[in-house]
């Protein structure tokens, strides 16, 4: 009103939602008698008396503040218990004589809103979008006043940049009062923001001061064509027989294209498509030499039907073939000589080994074994291996068989075996040669021979344990064109005396037979446990 | 007040092309997406397809190939064609407004029945 | 994809109870999770967003929690109205819906 005093400006209050605002009257004395107040809550410009003051007791009026309020500090201050977002208003005391003065003050609420709730885009952005796409939406619930948003990229505000980002910010007001402020995010994005981190920041004030709260960071699927394809091989490295081997399209396009593997075919100069699984992954497994070639990409854009090639890829599948070994089947005299000469070919330079079978002994680096002065012994197996250095595991076996010629050659010669009388009892007796021997017993018995290999064989005679045979014993003779030999297994029955705790028994010395074409077998020891052989 | 309703034939021959229309109303299909959902008899709800405010168009990739979605903002209409319908695409179609700040669907057409049968 | 699993598929309870259903997310969706509601011959309504936010007009009975992969709709004390199909649907990679919750009267 023209010609009035100015007001003073009301004194600051600042609260936050659910405390208690304390409403301290600053009429001095000289303006009015603090034992004499009446205050006012003022809401758009109109004056409603919420409180009353008489001889220092306060006396709440009807309506909203009615339990809401209390008188402290002997009377000097008002007392808002669970502010709310409504309460931000002036509120002013008014003395009663001398003169009648107001004190006003300006009640500020405040409250944090909740963290912020960020939602993705959850079908993607292509890049080549016409417009702003939505990337991101940000809610922050029940703050006040209104708090700010700021959208932040890889850590740094984003601001907006026409046709390039757009914000897009609105609030509601909940039954509370409170404010609900949401906003979205659009921006036209390039490849390179398919790692890009987005987040939002809610900016607001409590009476500490300012404050803010970001959201959880967010990467926004990015669509974008592919430019450039290529092949992978798994593993990496040398390749060879017998592995698994993935063959792999990859492209810099998101979502990937459809894929399709040709392998190009050297006879007739066209490429051929391969079968891929359902993630267009060609499978060699097992890998072979054939899988071996140029090998090639294509990527189809199944919205605009353009398609890529990838740069050709060679395939190498190493390989060693089967190993030869010549002769495939020698035979010699004794005292002779051999030479076996290994051969294999494949992708790698190769390397030989000659083994012996039953030790694995190596007895020779290099394609060829040469054997002189060739003794019984020498007979059996000689195994080549040809491998490749630079790969390992990748090698083929032969083994070939050397027999020498000869009369049978007994295992044993003599033999005691333990028995019960009337037992069946269970005899081997095994003799080698070449060629191969036949075992005859000369007791009747049920008798069956096998092969343990082609010049060994290995008889087994099941007999009843009687007084004549426990006498005599049991011979069993190997022959071939060239001889026979003999072995002799003595029969002894078992007593309390001879099952001592460390018994055992000695062979007898080997002798030679009879036979005109044989020479006898090695002197030989043998021990054996005090049992029988076999209980009937 | 915000509505979408769908229109098209009740019947389609397996194998024919199937083309839906969503008509809105109470907003501006530049300022909310729309989805198209179905539901087989009996069955649970399926996200078909979706053009964003911008225009921008995704589609389910189980049925991407067979799918044209489109919009024609001064009609206030969302057209879907389906390609190569089977019997197992009967189902009652909707169309669904995303809401302007969030990923969910707070308006739904009330639905087209689409029988596919010879 | 991302598979969303509802349990149970169909529950039996009475006006005034305190009805649960839960969701489970094949992975992580953070709170990207809706619940609508859906009456016979009816297009689905949009009860809970953001995984506890109520929409604007459904009734506070009706409360939403969870968050990574497991989340869960609360109706506490049912009434006549509420006897319906739920369904919660992920908005965290595209858009995929559980397979119902039938609620009947017992």
């Known amino acids: 009103v023209p010609g009035e005093a100015e007001q003073p400006a009301p004194e600051l209050v600042e609260v936050e939602v659910g405390s208690t605002a304390l409403l301290k009257c600053g009429l001095s004395q000289s303006q009015g008698n603090l034992s004499h107040v009446d205050w006012f809550s003022v809401h758009k410009e109109k004056r409603t008396l919420i409180f009353r003051v008489r001889q220092g007791q306060g006396q709440s009026e009807p309506g909203e503040y009615e339990q809401r309020l209390s008188l402290q500090d002997r009377g000097a201050t008002l007392a808002l218990t669970q502010v709310t977002p409504q309460d931000e208003r002036i509120f002013l005391c008014q003395g009663k004589r001398p003169r009648s003065q107001e004190y006003r003050i300006q009640l500020r609420v405040y409250k944090a809103p909740e963290e912020p709730n960020i939602q993705v885009n959850p079908l993607g952005i292509p890049v080549n979008s016409k417009e702003p796409e939505e990337v991101a939406t940000c809610v922050g619930r029940n703050g006040y006043p209104i708090p700010q948003v700021i959208w932040y990229k890889n850590g740094r505000p984003l601001k907006e940049e026409k046709n390039r980002v757009h914000i897009q910010s609105s609030q509601t007001v909940e039954s509370s009062g409170l404010y609900t402020l949401q906003s979205i995010l659009k921006a036209q994005l390039v490849k390179e923001d398919k790692d890009a981190q987005f987040y939002c920041e809610l900016n607001y004030r409590l009476p500490s001061g300012n404050h803010m709260k970001e959201s959880r960071e967010v990467t926004v699927p990015v669509f974008y064509p592919t430019e450039k394809v290529w092949l992978e091989v798994e593993p990496v490295g040398m390749l060879k027989e017998g592995d698994r081997v993935e063959i792999r399209c990859l492209a810099d396009g998101n979502p990937p294209p459809h894929f399709s593997i040709s392998k190009g075919n050297p006879s007739t100069r066209e490429a051929e498509e391969e079968t891929t699984n359902d993630n267009g992954v060609l499978v060699l497994e097992p890998a072979r030499k054939e899988h071996s070639g140029r090998y090639e990409c294509q990527a189809w854009n199944l919205d605009t039907m353009i398609s890529l090639l990838s740069e050709p890829q060679e395939l190498l599948v190493n390989y060693v073939s089967d190993v030869r070994v010549s002769p495939a089947a020698p035979e010699r005299q004794e005292g002779s000589s051999l030479t076996l000469t290994c051969e294999a070919e494949s992708s790698q330079d190769l390397e030989f080994q000659w083994l012996r079978e039953e030790t694995d002994q190596v007895l020779e680096r290099g394609p060829v074994l040469q054997l002189h002065d060739l003794k019984r012994e020498a007979g059996g197996g000689y195994r080549c291996v040809a491998s490749v250095p630079s790969i390992p595991g990748l090698n083929r076996t032969q083994l070939v068989k050397l027999a020498i010629f000869g009369p049978p050659w007994m295992a044993f010669k003599e033999r005691k075996v333990w028995v019960k009388e009337n037992m069946v009892l269970n005899l081997s007796c095994e003799a080698s040669g070449h060629p191969r021997p036949t075992i005859s017993w000369n007791v009747n018995g049920t008798a069956s021979e096998g092969d343990q290999d082609p010049q060994r064989v290995l008889s087994t005679l099941n007999v009843l344990v009687t007084p004549e045979l426990l006498e005599t014993g049991v011979e069993c003779t190997a022959s071939n064109d060239l001889g026979k030999n003999t072995s002799i297994l003595f029969l002894e029955l078992v007593n309390l005396t001879t099952l001592t705790p460390d018994s055992n028994t000695t062979t007898g010395l080997s002798t030679s037979t009879a036979s005109p074409h044989t020479r006898a077998n090695s002197t030989s020891t043998e021990r054996k446990l005090p049992e029988p052989e076999s209980r009937g | 007040q915000v509505t979408l309703k769908e229109s098209g034939p009740v019947l389609v021959k397996p194998t024919e092309t199937l083309t839906l229309t969503c008509t809105v109303s109470?907003?501006?299909?530049?300022?909310?997406?729309v989805s198209w959902v179905r539901q087989p008899p009996g069955k649970a709800l399926e996200w078909i397809a979706a053009?964003?405010?911008?225009?921008?168009?995704y589609y389910n990739s189980a049925f991407k190939s067979r799918l044209t979605i489109s919009r024609d903002t001064s009609k206030s209409q969302v057209v879907l064609t389906m390609t190569n319908m089977d019997p197992v695409d009967t189902a009652t179609y909707y169309c669904?407004?995303?809401?302007?700040?969030?990923?969910?669907?707070?308006?739904w057409g009330q639905g087209t029945l689409v029988t596919v049968s010879s | 994809d991302i598979q969303m699993t509802q349990s149970p598929s169909s529950l039996s309870a009475s006006v005034g109870d305190r009805v649960t259903i839960t969701c489970k997310a094949s992975?992580?969706?953070?709170?990207?999770l809706a619940w609508y509601q859906q009456k016979p011959g009816k297009a689905p309504k949009v009860l809970i967003f953001?995984?506890?936010s109520l929409q604007t007009g459904v009734p506070s009975r009706f409360s939403g929690s969870g968050s990574g992969t497991d989340f869960t709709l609360t109706i506490s004390s049912l009434q006549p109205e509420d006897f319906a199909t739920y369904y919660c649907?992920?908005?965290?990679?595209?858009?995929?819906f559980g397979q119902g919750t039938k609620l009947e009267i017992k």
């Open positions: 669904a407004r995303r809401y302007g700040y969030g990923w969910y669907f707070d308006f």
């Open positions: 109470g907003f501006s299909l530049t300022s909310n997406g």
């Open positions: 053009i964003s405010s911008g225009g921008t168009t």
């Open positions: 992975q992580n969706i953070y709170n990207s």
């Open positions: 953001n995984a506890n």
């Open positions: 649907q992920q908005f965290y990679s595209g858009y995929t």
